[in-house]
């Protein structure tokens, strides 16, 4: 089938002791090959800093995956989910204020 | 092969402003960040900031907030910084980085010499 | 602010001889955000290692480094005419970003 870019959604969800948890999801997503990090100002995080979920199929003849992180209250501004789908790419900030959703359909 | 290459060396007068750019190649310019370091004759690095060209979210130096600009054209790869109202102590040589898969400095330009003086 | 500080300012070494550079952290980094340059008059820097201990590509295997906490070791094993240099060590864990003052690899 023909190349089908992933939409990219990231939230936080706060956990104890001053610190957030980011979740960077992408679905719908053709073919299954996909890069997706978690990058602190640019730079990728550590693989043992990060947990990943499996590529699985979504129903539709894509995929999805997901990819989080811990990091410090007040520090969002400095992470960005990092995404690579077939020649694509993109950056993905977490979301500040009050907003705790970001989408982004990648062309 | 990754490049930074950076405008000429400038002359400027206390109190002028001067932009200086850096034009990226050998790589997808916004799939990296940008970031500016100076060095004064004989001393140190001190980072300056940082753009994400992808999404043009910049970070600044506090030090460095209210005098400075970083900028990005997607369309050239090229990033931009603009100091303003300039003093002696401005007088460095700046450079442009770009941030690697594990480290924040991975290639950098050659360096563009700005002297402050009246 | 995480201030690092090198020592000694100035390192005086023959080639051949074991050169050992030393940074201290002001507070606790993670390994993950301790990386070295390397830098010769003139010319910009360039990294050489990341994370404490990891080789940037073309980096010399002489070239080592250590350390976790607060105190952070770059090691050159056996000096070449090549290494004489200034080296900085530099943290990305909190911002400001900040750089060591470096430490000046001379020939003695």
């Known amino acids: 089938g023909s190349t089908v870019p992933p939409m990219v959604n990231v939230t936080c969800s706060e956990v104890s002791e001053g610190n957030i948890t980011v979740t960077c999801r992408a679905s719908s997503f053709y073919p299954r090959n996909i890069t997706l990090t978690w990058r602190q100002d640019g730079v990728s995080l550590s693989h043992n800093t990060q947990q990943w979920g499996d590529v699985l199929p979504d129903g539709n003849g894509t995929y999805q995956t997901w990819v989080a992180t811990r990091i410090r209250q007040g520090e969002e501004q400095r992470f960005t989910c990092y995404m690579e789908h077939s020649g694509n790419h993109g950056t993905h900030p977490v979301p500040s204020g009050n907003s705790h959703h970001h989408h982004h359909h990648h062309h | 092969e990754v490049q930074l290459v950076q405008s000429g060396a400038e002359v400027k007068k206390p109190g002028a402003s001067v932009k200086v750019s850096c034009k990226a190649s050998g790589y997808a310019f916004t799939s990296n960040n940008i970031y500016w370091v100076r060095q004064a004759p004989g001393q140190g690095l001190e980072w300056i900031g940082y753009i994400d060209p992808y999404i043009g979210r910049i970070i600044y130096n506090q030090q460095f907030k209210d005098r400075v600009t970083i900028t990005a054209d997607t369309s050239t790869s090229t990033a931009y910084l603009e100091l303003s109202s300039l003093r002696s102590e401005d007088t460095a040589v700046y450079y442009c980085?770009?941030?690697?898969?594990?480290?924040?400095?991975?290639?950098w330009g050659q360096g563009t010499l700005v002297t402050v003086s009246s | 602010e995480i201030v690092l500080t090198q020592s000694p300012a100035t390192l005086s070494l023959s080639p051949g001889e074991r050169a050992t550079l030393s940074c201290s952290a002001s507070?606790?980094?993670?390994?993950?955000?301790l990386h070295w340059y390397q830098q010769k008059p003139g010319q910009a820097p360039r990294l050489l290692i990341y994370r404490t201990s990891n080789l940037a590509s073309g980096i010399p295997a002489r070239f080592s480094g250590s350390g976790s906490g607060t105190d952070f070791t770059l090691t050159i094993s056996s000096l070449e005419p090549e290494d004489f240099a200034v080296y900085y060590c530099?943290?990305?864990?909190?911002?400001?970003?900040?750089f060591g003052q470096g430490t000046k690899v001379e020939i003695k």
């Open positions: 507070s606790s980094i993670s390994s993950n955000y």
């Open positions: 980085s770009r941030s690697g898969e594990r480290s924040n400095f991975d290639y």
């Open positions: 530099q943290q990305g864990g909190s911002l400001p970003l900040t």
